[in-house]
């Protein structure tokens, strides 16, 4: 008799896009409409929840822009929270200072991406320093991962 | 008798580098010489043509530079075109405004990378706002993808 | 009799973080403590040593900052060295010029990431133009790869 068909495991992957009704940290994300992907990973209150331990490539891009540059320091962090640990772990971070000409309309992006060993129940979030300066277009601000 | 050797499927992957004879949009790419990769994906008139539906990590970097900064708005887009859809879909985008000191020699990069669910016959392209400000060195300006 | 258990190959992966005792080029990296990963790849004197030919996604981020901007040109390179070739091959590079306001405290990141066909015994390194301007926090400056 022929062997049972190989069960093709679903790839664990997420690509979430900017959601303009984010009011506080961590950033919230669109998990349903547009060019969104969410498979084998859960989305909960701004966070991607890992349900299988392993190696993951995690990435995020944030698009900052303003109308009258004041050069407020900008930061963009991807961090991890797990009930076993008391403190958030900053996995990746980008900072910008003195990035535009005073008074000018300005725009700048921060991109982060790297490989991490994540554990089941880890929650991953994105934080920014100046929420009012983030533009949430789906092509400009996003957060994702995939299991290697 | 021993089982037939497993047929190892070729990884679908591309890494194309800057081509300085780009004259209009979309950007054209070097698909033959240097550190180029092209396997299981076709290159046609500036575009990467998907021939197998699935999840892909897509990335691009563009290196902008100029002799005398006048802060022209810069944009860098990765977009998708498919004959089934009337309009291009912008997958990822980076924008820069007010990024250098007027009159100075300047240089800046834009990097994009994320996961997308692509369909057979999708064509992926890269667009920039100011072609004359792009430097096409193979290490500086590139476009690639791989199937997860 | 049941077939022998499938030997699950260890994923070839590395994620190294900034090491502040770098004194010269190439940059040196933390390969032991913190959010570091090193599996199926060796680390030697600043370099990641490939021990299996194949396709790899290689990435690096460097965080530059200073107390008083004088717009020194910044460069960030990932390059490859192999005893078979006389010269280093620059795989990816980012350059910045005229990026901050003279005299101001400033901060900026450079991110690089792409797919390459690497050969056993290739050594990969990261180079920067201004070592004194690099901040080595593990979340800010890193270097990694994984085999596709």
């Amino acid at each position: 008799p022929s062997p049972p068909p190989e069960k093709k495991e679903l790839r664990k992957v997420a690509h979430l896009t900017g959601k303009s009704n984010s009011r506080s940290m961590p950033l919230e994300w669109e998990d349903t409409y547009g060019i969104v992907l969410l498979s084998g990973v859960k989305y909960k209150k701004g966070g991607l929840v890992i349900n299988e331990t392993g190696l993951y490539f995690v990435y995020s891009k944030v698009y900052f822009r303003g109308q009258s540059c004041n050069n407020l320091p900008l930061s963009h962090k991807v961090y991890m929270r797990n009930s076993k640990y008391p403190q958030d772990l900053v996995m990746m971070e980008g900072k910008m200072m003195s990035y535009c000409t005073t008074g000018q309309m300005w725009a700048r992006s921060s991109y982060l991406g790297a490989v991490f060993n994540l554990t089941s129940a880890d929650h991953l979030y994105v934080n920014v320093s100046e929420l009012s300066l983030v533009n949430f277009e789906e092509s400009q601000t996003f957060f994702g991962l995939y299991k290697l | 008798p021993s089982p037939p050797p497993e047929k190892k499927e070729l990884r679908k992957v591309a890494h194309l580098t800057g081509k300085s004879n780009s004259r209009s949009m979309p950007l054209e790419w070097e698909d033959t010489y240097g550190i180029v990769l092209l396997s299981g994906v076709k290159y046609k008139k500036g575009g990467l043509v998907i021939n197998e539906t699935g999840l892909y990590f897509v990335y691009s970097k563009v290196y902008f530079r100029g002799q005398s900064c006048n802060n022209l708005p810069l944009s860098h887009k990765v977009y998708m075109r498919n004959s089934k859809y009337p309009q291009d879909l912008v997958m990822m985008e980076g924008k820069m405004m007010s990024y250098c000191t007027t009159g100075q020699m300047w240089a800046r990069s834009s990097y994009l990378g994320a996961v997308f669910n692509l369909t057979s016959a999708d064509h992926l392209y890269v667009n920039v706002s100011e072609l004359s400000l792009v430097n096409f060195e193979e290490s500086q300006t590139f476009f690639g993808l791989y199937k997860l | 009799p049941s077939p022998p258990p499938e030997k699950k190959e260890l994923r070839k992966v590395a994620h190294l973080t900034g090491k502040s005792n770098s004194r010269s080029m190439p940059l040196e990296w933390e390969d032991t403590y913190g959010i570091v990963l090193l599996s199926g790849v060796k680390y030697k004197k600043g370099g990641l040593v490939i021990n299996e030919t194949g396709l790899y996604f290689v990435y690096s981020k460097v965080y530059f900052r200073g107390q008083s901007c004088n717009n020194l040109p910044l460069s960030h390179k990932v390059y490859m060295r192999n005893s078979k070739y006389p010269q280093d091959l620059v795989m990816m590079e980012g350059k910045m010029m005229s990026y901050c306001t003279t005299g101001q405290m400033w901060a900026r990141s450079s991110y690089l990431g792409a797919v390459f066909n690497l050969t056993s015994a290739d050594h990969l390194y990261v180079n920067v133009s201004e070592l004194s301007l690099v901040n080595f926090e593990e979340s800010q400056t890193f270097f990694g790869l994984y085999k596709l």
Epitope: Q67, S68, N70, L72, T101, T102, M105, S132 | - | T101
Partner: antibody
Framework: QVQLVQSGAEVKKPGASVKVSCKAS????????IHWVRQAPGQGLEWMGV????????SYNQKFKGRVTMTVDTSTSTVYMELSSLRSEDTAVYYC????????????WGQGTLVTVSS | EIVMTQSPATLSVSPGERATLSCKAS??????????MNWYQQKPGQAPRLLIY???NLESGIPARFSGSGSGTEFTLTISSLQSEDFAVYYC?????????FGQGTKLEIK
């Protein structure tokens, strides 16, 4: 509530300098740039320049370059605009106005300071 | 620099009637889907007050009888039913790039 309170009227002789202050309250001072706009008697509005309250550097209208200096004192949430080499045509009401970086326009203005240049 | 031209210089309208003020820019003040055009009201002895930002957005606290429209180089401020407190000078201003420039103003007077 948000307030921008400017210093009082000044009378200056041609060739002299004047320094006008603008004290902010009711909001986070370093979150907004401060712009200066002037209005000659019976005339329209003229943009002079802008200062970063966070970083302290300024961008000026070319017309005033070399004569105008904008400074900030974050400890008192005050911005200053100094105009030198005064001439009679500098007689005007000088306004400061805040501009939120995330918005499109100057949303709150000071009450104005009349500077009269006369020999 | 971008030159802003307002018309008419003076507009005489009766209370309760509609007023339409025009502003033209010497080059487009649009970028990325937004029009960087603002309208201010100024009464004698007072500082300007923001009415409309980004061509058509009503500033908080401004009555709904004020509206703005236009894009590119041509913009309009409309006051649907003039109240006595609306008689003042109105300025358009672009914030597309530095230097910001204002129109010369339109004086709205009682007919």
């Amino acid at each position: 509530q948000v307030q921008l309170v400017q210093s009082g009227a000044e009378v200056k002789k041609p060739g002299a300098s004047v320094k006008v202050s603008c004290k902010a309250s009711g909001y986070t001072f370093t979150d907004y740039t401060i712009h200066w706009v002037r209005q000659a008697p019976g005339q329209g509005l003229e943009w002079m320049g802008v200062i970063s309250t966070y970083q302290g550097d300024a961008s000026y209208n070319q017309k005033f370059k070399g004569r105008v200096t904008m400074t900030v004192d974050t400890s008192t949430s005050t911005v200053y605009m100094e105009l030198s080499s005064l001439r009679s045509e500098d007689t005007a009401v000088y306004y400061c106005a805040r501009f939120p970086d995330w918005d499109y326009a100057m949303d709150y203005w000071g009450q104005g300071t009349l500077v009269t240049v006369s020999s | 620099e971008i030159v802003m031209t307002q018309s008419p210089a003076t507009l005489s309208v009766s209370p309760g009637e509609r007023a339409t003020l025009s502003c033209k820019a010497s080059q487009s003040v649009d970028y990325d889907g937004d029009s960087y055009m603002n309208w201010y009201q100024q009464k004698p002895g007072q500082a300007p007050r923001l009415l409309i930002y980004a061509a058509s957005n009503l500033e908080s606290g401004i009555p709904a009888r004020f509206s703005g429209s236009g894009s590119g180089t041509e913009f309009t401020l409309t006051i649907s039913s003039l109240q006595s407190e609306d008689f003042a000078v109105y300025y358009c201003q672009h914030s597309r790039e530095l230097p910001y420039t204002f129109g010369q103003g339109t004086k709205l007077e009682i007919k």
